[in-house]
């Protein structure tokens, strides 16, 4: 089975750890994809080690354990994010994550910094 | 983790053959695709051939029809039976390995992060 917190959020400019854990008696994992909604984020093959698709590579860290973390995080980042465990033999488990990600505190507390054009 | 050494590369006349092979080592699944990718000097890396998930294969165009990539999954072992030599195949051979299930079978090198040292091919006319 994958057991996995089914809703996180986290701020702006910061960072988040995706974790999913699998737990079987008979089942080892194989390989762990990760994916944000349809595009595939990165791969932990018990084979070849971590692979982080280039276009996150910038953002993205292998671990803790099998899973992520998104550092750098942005509105757009908001969303669903799918652990699928590929095991032998059982084949394959899935797990959904919905990150939620809001703006720093900072703004919210109307803290921001905007930049003041001379006057004159 | 996984290593791979190349072997059988050589010299050869343009019209012969050449069988290349690919031993992995120091993997517990042998769970992954593994390609042929060749390096000409002045050239860009070029993705030879593909091996995916369920035995499909993939070709580039300038081999296809000569060279035919097999796998012996119980030893882990990849070939490139290269036939119809020509001298533009003249390269440094390489094999990789990526993980399965990373979209389609294709020869983009982006997902293959473990290569051989490679074994050197030349066709001379």
């Known amino acids: 089975t994958i057991d996995t917190k089914r809703n996180i959020s986290a701020e702006e400019g910061g960072s988040v750890i995706l974790q999913c854990h699998f737990s079987s008696d008979t089942a080892e994992v194989t390989q762990v994809d990760w994916k944000q909604q349809d595009q595939l984020l990165a791969i932990y093959s018990v084979d070849l080690g971590w692979h982080v698709a280039s276009v996150f590579s910038d953002r993205v860290v292998p671990g803790p354990s099998l899973g992520l973390t998104f550092q750098s995080l942005t509105m757009n980042d908001t969303g669903e994010y799918f652990c699928t465990y590929h095991t032998y033999p059982g084949g394959i488990y899935k797990g959904r994550i919905f990150l939620k990600v809001q703006e720093s505190s900072d703004d919210r507390n109307g803290l921001a910094q905007f930049q003041t054009a001379p006057l004159g | 983790q996984v290593q791979l050494a190349e072997s059988g590369g050589g010299s050869v006349q343009a019209g012969g053959s050449l069988r290349l092979s690919c031993a992995a080592s120091g993997y517990k699944y042998g769970v992954y695709s593994m390609g042929w990718f060749r390096l000409a000097p002045g050239k860009e890396r070029e993705g030879v051939a593909a091996i995916c998930s369920g035995g499909r294969t993939t070709y580039s165009d300038s081999v296809k029809g000569r060279f035919t990539i097999s796998k012996d999954s119980a030893n882990q072992i990849l070939y490139l039976q290269m036939n119809s030599l020509k001298p533009e195949d003249t390269a440094m051979y390489y094999c990789?390995?990526?993980?399965?299930?990373?979209?389609?079978?294709?020869?983009?090198?982006?997902?293959?992060?473990?290569w051989g040292q490679g074994t050197q091919v030349t066709v001379s006319s």
């Open positions: 990789a390995a990526r993980p399965l299930w990373t979209g389609d079978c294709d020869l983009s090198s982006s997902w293959y992060k473990t």
